[in-house]
Interface confidence: low
């Protein structure tokens, strides 16, 4: 059976595309939507049944320099009486984001994209129980 | 992190701020971390504030696929497996940076874009407003 010809197979590169050396890409780090703000419910990190704390990590050779990481406060979850229930588990919820890393090699500076895994908050889950034979 | 000291013989072009436009290596660090939350854990099903994951795809963006969480219930799941409306399932949102093709359709030219994603849900005690 003759395989039908695959159609137009690539984004047409517009004439306006900037020239870029091989193996690299041009990145404008002026952020689109820079002033967008998170509109999460108030103090959810304290009101959650799986509460968490925030830590700010700072690195001058990373853009953005500040990355906020959450850490679950408990192994278990907080019950209606305000006590920790260890029959349930507080677990971290994670999300990837991109950062730009600045590297110094001798007198030259290079830039590298990096995926960073950010812990955003915690959720309360029923544990998986493994039964040993 | 610390700023790596420069060789004293280097021209003094060190700038504490990042330049507006940079050329970056196409290779990405930590690129093999798992990007599909459905594959990385089943918390979305086991949580007391479970959520569904919706695929958001945009070929002009990297990553082209982002998963958005939507809480399944207003309340939370109690020990009996029922929805308890005395508690609230709320989304946990996070600003992340992605790459946007700029100009559009160009293979190797991007701009950073900040987007707001709902990553999962958590169960919270509601704020009760008492009306006088």
């Amino acid at each position: 059976r003759k395989i039908p010809k695959v159609g137009h197979t690539f984004f047409q590169k517009p004439e306006s595309c900037p020239p870029v050396p091989g193996g690299s890409m041009k990145l404008d780090i002026g952020i689109i939507n820079e002033n967008q703000r998170v509109s999460m419910s108030r103090n959810i990190e304290s009101r959650s049944t799986s509460p968490w704390n925030y830590t700010v990590t700072w690195d001058p050779n990373r853009y953005p320099s500040e990355v906020v990481q959450a850490q679950c406060r408990n192994l278990g979850c907080i019950n209606a009486q305000g006590k920790e229930d260890i029959s349930m588990n507080s677990v971290p919820i994670q999300q990837e984001t991109l950062v730009v890393r600045r590297k110094h090699q001798g007198c030259s500076v290079s830039f590298q994209l990096e995926k960073v895994l950010v812990t955003v908050g915690c959720t309360c889950v029923t544990p998986v129980i493994h039964h040993v034979q | 992190g610390i700023t790596i000291p420069r060789n004293p013989g280097c021209p003094n072009s060190e700038d504490k701020n990042f330049p507006r436009t940079v050329m970056v290596n196409l290779n990405i660090h930590n690129r093999n971390t798992n990007t599909n939350p459905k594959r990385s854990s089943d918390y979305y099903n086991r949580s007391t504030s479970p959520w569904n994951l919706h695929r958001n795809e945009d070929p002009e963006r990297y990553p082209s696929v982002i998963w958005e969480a939507k809480c399944r219930h207003l309340g939370c799941i109690n020990a009996d497996g029922n929805v308890d409306y005395h508690m609230n399932s709320v989304p946990i949102q996070q600003e992340i940076l992605v790459l946007r093709r700029e100009p559009p359709h160009c293979p190797n030219s991007f701009r950073l874009e900040k987007i707001l994603v709902s990553v999962g849900c958590t169960c919270v005690t509601p704020i009760v407003h008492h009306v006088a």
Partner: nanobody, 122 residues
Framework: EVQLVESGGGLVQAGGSLRLSCAAS??????MGWLRQAPGKEREFVAA????????YYADSVKGRFTISKDNAGITMYLQMNSLKPEDTAVYYC?????????????????WGQGTQVTVSS
Amino acid sequence: EVQLVESGGGLVQAGGSLRLSCAASGRTYDAMGWLRQAPGKEREFVAAISGSGDDTYYADSVKGRFTISKDNAGITMYLQMNSLKPEDTAVYYCATRRGLYYVWDSNDYENWGQGTQVTVSS
């Protein structure tokens, strides 16, 4: 949906060569790639080529030994594998994707072939 059919796998001695082929039919794509999975390991990126054929990408572990190419019609993609090593033993998959963002991110490939076994004996 793109249909993909791989061929060309087999058993070869270390230092030998193989040529894999992948025939594509159906929807358009921006890039085609070869990915592999060794027993008990994660699926990993090997090489990719843009739909236009202008851009090729290789994993560090195969650079200089493997060459990816495609025919002018964009229907068949090839992976010429030279100087094969025992650690190249794996099931090799052909896959397509939209966008050339990071062709080495195996999670972003949408359509996969059934795979072809490559075994390199020492």
